[in-house]
Interface confidence: low
């Protein structure tokens, strides 16, 4: 299905609006520090060129690959060396090495200012004055801060962003209408970004096979009525889509995602009974809806797994003939029967099954050797079940904020070398598992909790990879994708850690804390908690609780004082002295 001009092909498939939006996202994800105006100029130049190719596919340079065209365009940026340093060296390379080089320089934690939300009236004026620029700016700001954001999904977010402003800027109470919608988009966007980051990490760090195994398990849970061949086809297509997006091939990715949605909707009878509503929606909503669709009901008459995978005399023959296919079938059959398991647990079970077959199919009596393989699954299933039960009990007892604090202490003691902002961000997100998943019935808790924790721990892994400081984090992150959570759970207090020198400045607070939102104030307190643990890793829960209670009372008292700044200065010194005494610092 070769086209004379790839750029013309994608322009025609996607349409001008989506083409321009996707090129902007691609450029902003690569050159994260470039000003908005520079990117718009580059996108306009690429778009004009694409139009000449649509008019005449044989025109000069129209036969070049998208990587060549886009890379050449990015390398025209005048300030590349000053702004990006060694990334400029990518421009000396030829494709495909040049694109790989750009990919390697994507920064998960770019040094960009926090996005501050202007007043509602200011935003509405900007929206009405120039809607197109306003929406482009949204794409640009999200893409540069989230360089792995799933591009076709970002188009869906932008559509909802536009709808929110269109509706709310006409409302009587603009703020009441708009702000909750923007909060929802922000929270959903962060979650979407983190989920996609795990997919890209899975592909890039652990290979296509790892991603395909994940996809077989997840799609089999979601579409338990679909045949194995159907699931395999969907997995192959989905892998192509995500490989493209994670590789910066956003036009191909968006195009192939649209094709996949079309295929799923045309074949929904053989895939799932839950797709009807999704398939009636416009393209962007349809793709999003399919990706989030609930699990179909399990077929009523599924036979025991043991027949084909334990009792059959042909197990080793089937395994030897096509190992990946046989293991894929095992994963499919197990997953469609277990929507109550997390995907990572299903992958651990498949791994255990495979290890057993490797050992047993070479034994004198294979059947005797693997006959009890399902018994080996029991402890693997019970471990996450018990962990979730204990943590949900703790969450229900403490509430979200204090549960986050418990996790902050736990993780700081495990990996105290990790930077304080990273520990705060990751522990806060780990703590959100409580409100997200503990409300669910038993049958939905594990897939909710453990697969969410995989996403959050991946955030820790990608942030740590940028500046590695802990061998323990590196070990848990790199050795096994599906065992990351058990690896971190198993870490005890790091006895090799030398406590941080006490620095009173770290615990000096000012009146500005009083004007912060509740969330920002929590983050300040949690930052102090992490620093306390880094100074005194052996502090007991009771000691830390006492200091944190004193700290909360101190902030409350000084925020009510007439002379707030003096209160923070004087009472702060007393608090530091009392805390040092309480913790023996």
């Amino acid at each position: 299905d070769a086209h004379k001009s790839e750029v013309a092909h994608r322009f025609k498939d996607l349409g001008e609006e989506n083409f321009k939006a996707l090129v902007l996202i691609a450029f902003a994800q690569y050159l994260q520090q470039c000003p908005f105006e520079d990117h718009v100029k580059l996108v306009n130049e690429v778009t004009e060129f694409a139009k000449t190719c649509v008019a005449d596919e044989s025109a000069e340079n129209c036969d070049k690959s998208l990587h060549t065209l886009f890379g050449d365009k990015l390398c025209t940026v005048a300030t590349l060396r000053e702004t990006y340093g060694e990334m400029a060296d990518c421009c000396a390379k030829q494709e495909p090495e040049r694109n790989e080089c750009f990919l390697q320089h994507k920064d998960d934690n770019p040094n960009l200012p926090r996005l501050v939300r202007p007043e509602v009236d200011v935003m509405c004026t900007a929206f009405h004055d120039n809607e197109e620029t306003f929406l482009k700016k949204y794409l640009y700001e999200i893409a540069r801060r989230h360089p792995y954001f799933y591009a076709p999904e970002l188009l869906f977010f932008a559509k909802r962003y536009k709808a929110a402003f269109t509706e709310c800027c006409q409302a009587a109470d603009k703020a009441a209408c708009l702000l909750p919608k923007l909060d929802e988009l922000r929270d959903e966007g962060k979650a979407s970004s983190a989920k996609q980051r795990l997919k890209c990490a899975s592909l890039q760090k652990f290979g296509e096979r790892a991603f395909k195994a994940w996809a077989v398990a997840r799609l089999s849970q979601r579409f338990p009525k679909a045949e194995f061949a159907e699931v395999s086809k969907l997995v192959t297509d989905l892998t192509k889509v995500h490989t493209e997006c994670c590789h910066g091939d956003l036009l191909e990715c968006a195009d192939d995602r649209a094709d996949l949605a079309k295929y799923i909707c045309e074949n929904q009878d053989s895939i799932s009974s839950k797709l009807k509503e999704c398939c009636e929606k416009p393209l962007l909503e349809k793709s999003h809806c399919i990706a989030e669709v609930e699990n179909d009901e399990m077929p009523a008459d599924l036979p025991s797994l043991a027949a084909d995978f334990v009792e059959s005399k042909d197990v080793c023959k089937n395994y030897a003939e096509a190992k990946d296919v046989f293991l894929g079938m095992f994963l499919y059959e197990y997953a469609r029967r277990h929507p109550d398991y997390s995907v990572v647990l299903l992958l651990r079970l498949a791994k255990t099954y495979e290890t057993t077959l490797e050992k047993c199919c070479a034994a004198a009596d294979p059947h005797e050797c693997y006959a009890k393989v399902f018994d080996e699954f029991k402890p693997l299933v019970e471990e996450p079940q018990n962990l979730i039960k204990q943590n949900c009990e703790l969450f229900e007892q403490l509430g979200e904020y204090k549960f986050q604090n418990a996790l902050l202490v736990r993780y700081t003691k495990k990996v105290p070398q990790v930077s304080t902002p990273t520990l705060v961000e990751v522990s806060r997100n780990l703590g959100k598992v409580g409100s997200k998943c503990c409300k669910h019935p038993e049958a939905k808790r594990m897939p909710c909790a453990e697969d969410y924790l995989s996403v959050v721990l991946n955030q820790l892994c990608v942030l740590h990879e940028k500046t590695p400081v802990s061998d323990r984090v590196t070990k848990c992150c790199t050795e096994s994708l599906v065992n990351r959570r058990p690896c971190f759970s198993a870490l005890e207090v790091d006895e090799t850690y030398v406590p941080k020198e006490f620095n009173a400045e770290t615990f000096t607070f000012h009146a500005d804390i009083c004007t912060l939102s509740e969330k920002e104030r929590q983050i300040k307190k949690q930052t102090a908690l992490v620093e306390l643990v880094k100074h005194k890793p052996k502090a007991t829960k009771e000691q830390l609780k006492a200091v944190m209670d004193d700290f909360a009372a101190f902030v409350e008292k000084c925020c009510k004082a007439d002379d707030k700044e003096t209160c923070f200065a004087e009472e702060g010194k007393k608090l530091v002295a009392a805390s040092q005494a309480a913790l023996g610092l």
Partner: nanobody
Framework: QVQLVESGGGLVQPGGSLRLSCSAS????????MGWYRQAPGKQRELVAS???????HYADTVKGRFTISRDNSKNMVYLQMNSLRAEDTAVYYC?????????WGQGTQVTVSS
């Protein structure tokens, strides 16, 4: 059955070099990680170097700049080039290959650095 066999160990003078090889016989589904660990007498086994399927490498601080890990995907082989060897590098070196959630270990090869 999967078996890992290490080779290339031996006695070498301080400052010398050795190249360890590890070959996997049998088929392992979806290798994600290959690594070298070592264990000196009376000490814990420790990670020396590891390499993921995409070629990303990780080294223990004590060997950075001296040791290089590499792999040959087509042959299920992993190598460790050890230069500027020191007495404290003396240990049994083990090869480790992992996939979805478990690992396979070799029997180990002795490396002795002594004058």
């Amino acid at each position: 059955q999967v078996q890992l066999v290490e080779s290339g160990g031996g006695l070498v003078q301080p400052g010398g070099s050795l190249r360890l090889s590890c070959s996997a016989s049998g088929s392992i589904w979806g290798i994600y990680h290959m690594g070298w660990y070592r264990q000196a007498p009376g000490k814990q086994r420790e990670l020396v170097a590891s390499i993921t399927v995409d070629g990303s490498t990780h080294y223990a601080d004590t060997v950075k700049g001296r040791f290089t890990i590499s792999r040959d995907n087509s042959k299920n082989m992993v190598y460790l080039q050890m230069n500027s060897l020191r007495a404290e590098d003396t240990a049994v070196y083990y090869c480790d290959i992992r996939n979805v959630g478990g690992d396979y270990w070799g029997q180990g090869t002795q490396v002795t650095v002594s004058s």
